[in-house]
Amino acid sequence: IWELKKDVYVVELDWYPDAPGEMVVLTCDTPEEDGITWTLDQSSEVLGSGKTLTIQVKEFGDAGQYTCHKGGEVLSHSLLLLHKKEDGIWSTDILKDQKEPKNKTFLRCEAKNYSGRFTCWWLTTISTDLTFSVKSSRGSSDPQGVTCGAATLSAERVRGDNKEYEYSVECQEDSACPAAEESLPIEVMVDAVHKLKYENYTSSFFIRDIIKPDPPKNLQLKPLKNSRQVEVSWEYPDTWSTPHSYFSLTFCVQVQGKSKREKKDRVFTDKTSATVICRKNASISVRAQDRYYSSSWSEWASVPCS
Amino acid sequence: RAVPGGSSPAWTQCQQLSQKLCTLAWSAHPLVGHMDLREEGDEETTNDVPHIQCGDGCDPQGLRDNSQFCLQRIHQGLIFYEKLLGSDIFTGEPSLLPDSPVGQLHASLLGLSQLLQPEGHHWETQQIPSLSPSQPWQRLLLRFKILRSLQAFVAVAARVFAHGAATLSP
């Protein structure tokens, strides 16, 4: 058993049929010595008396808010949550496996630049009685500070018969050094509590590996005289690290119709302009990637050909 | 060339070669990018590699103030990785294809380090750790880790030379 926060405790349980459970001793936070009784949740049934209460925690019915009273007055509370371990593996019932970039990916994180700011998100089908708390650091043995905000519900989607909820959190490294080569990964830890179930999820990454630039901005077309060709130009996204002579991007320019199966024109360039062949009813799209490190491509920025 | 005394390197040449190094480092093992090597635990294997750190003056402002600190750091790293790529880790079993990008990567590391330090001048170099994995699978894992680390190192070096070529070239 360990303390998650004031008056909230997590009991770690091996979860299998007829498991003996865990013996837990609760102590009433009071100078009083006698006349103390214990109840669980809203029940008025007295579970025991005295300053301490010893219970055998085996299942969710044994978890909940234990309260000690004296003469009708509440003295203190202890909330017990359960953390299940099945076949040596901690349960992951609360969050959905996003399976990208690999199986058992519950947290996904992205950064728009090298400033040390990043966003993580996760998915769940649970809509109520759900709380998250997020902590982060650079490195684990001698951790350096990363400050995370509160996790918020950022999207709701319908998937078949189910509703899916996306939560996200923004974090910022306290003393970021955008130009340095990272040697210690960022660690992100998410505590998830659904009713009386506790789970924790972690992710470890270098900012450089989660970089995904915003799409290029200000796409413009200039038809070339006596030619089917069009010069397309664009600018670096505002959110990308500066100076651009240092933090350089490379680009992919593509001309394609509405369907992915249609013929297309495609060219890669380090410049902020390219010459392509435009067709009626097609669009010109441009996306960006770090020039020197193969992290994710941005989403496409597009303009119609006509 | 970046002489320890302080003259400027051939920024444009360094830029071209460092960008080539980036391409080669990813070609040498593109799949490395999809392996989460941190799960493999034995951190000490690549902890000893030289990293370009915050105080090394490799940021745009530091380069403007005095690029020598940064260039020395990059030079140290290039020599270090060049030795690693020439070591038993990469020459032992399982043997690499004669024409794998690792060979070109090795040569290009040497080429860039020579651009930065002409004959007869010496910056102190970091000792290469004695990593001699006994099993082929350990060697393979170590190669992945070294290449992954090299990808990060050459990315910073390439940014330095790109910025230098754009803003510090005579």
């Epitope: 089917r228 060709q229 490379t250 199966r261 249609e262 013929k263 297309k264 024109d265 495609r266 060219v267 890669f268 360039t269 380090d270 010459t275 062949i277 067709r279 009626k280 | 070609s27 593109p30």
Partner: antibody
Framework: EVQLQQSGADLVRSGASIKLSCTAS????????MHWVKQRPEQGLEWIGW????????EYAPKFQGKATMTADTSSNTAYLQLSSLTSEDTAVYYC???????????WGAGTTVTVSS | DIVLTQSPATLSVTPGDSVSLSCRAS??????LHWYQQKSHESPRLLIK???QSISGIPSRFSGYGSGTDFTLSINSVETEDFGRYFC?????????FGAGTKLELK
């Protein structure tokens, strides 16, 4: 299966013109760019140009401007290359290509050998 | 026009050897470079697109890398069916141009 059937070998007199055909099967040429590439005996490859059969748009390599004319007939699913004022320099194998992507060649015809005699 | 220089012009190898073919562009072309194989009396066929992207149906012993001006096609353990000519082609700008080719022959 995506295939390109090119017209047979031809022997033509210097100064004459010739029209080569390239008929597609297994796909509609409107959905592809059609290119022509020249290869002289024991030599490299030279790009002549492309046509978009959907709208008739064309682009030629400067070297072949005035020498080559590309057309396409979507009803017969065929692309054509006309070569005019033939000289011995035009003796070559001419390949047609069908390309989903404009700038590289993924489906090649078997080629048509053109021999120009004086 | 962008000029592509291939080297060597001829490469004599024994089956089982691994080889590298080089293609150099007269100016930077990012990764807009493609590789073709042409066997005797056959049409060329696409091996690699955009410097390093594999093509379905092409054996995995063919791989490419490079960007900017220097590109390499590698064949890991040459097989007898690999003998022929290899061309690089740039798609950075029109006119599209090819290298003169490297002939891979039996030693």
């Amino acid at each position: 299966e995506v295939q390109l059937q090119q017209s047979g070998a031809d022997l033509v007199r210097s100064g004459a013109s010739i029209k080569l055909s390239c008929t597609a099967s297994g796909f509609n040429i409107k959905d592809y760019y059609m290119h022509w590439v020249k290869q002289r005996p024991e030599q490299g490859l030279e790009w002549i140009g492309w046509i978009d059969p959907e709208n008739g748009d064309t682009e030629y390599a400067p070297k072949f401007q005035g020498k080559a004319t590309m057309t396409a007939d979507t009803s017969s699913n065929t692309a054509y290359l006309q070569l005019s004022s033939l000289t011995s320099e035009d003796t070559a194998v001419y390949y047609c290509n069908a390309c989903k992507e404009l700038r590289y060649f993924d489906v090649w015809g078997a080629g048509t050998t053109v021999t120009v005699s004086s | 026009d962008i000029v592509l220089t291939q080297s060597p012009a001829t490469l004599s190898v024994t089956p089982g050897d691994s080889v590298s073919l080089s293609c150099r562009a007269s100016q930077s072309i990012s990764i807009n470079l493609h590789w073709y194989q042409q066997k005797s009396h056959e049409s060329p066929r696409l091996l690699i697109k955009f410097a390093s992207q594999s093509i379905s149906g092409i054996p995995s012993r063919f791989s490419g890398y490079g960007s900017g001006t220097d590109f390499t096609l590698s064949i890991n353990s040459v097989e007898t069916e690999d003998f022929g000519r290899y061309f690089c082609q740039q798609s950075n700008s029109f006119p599209l141009t090819f290298g003169a080719g490297t002939k891979l022959e039996l030693k």
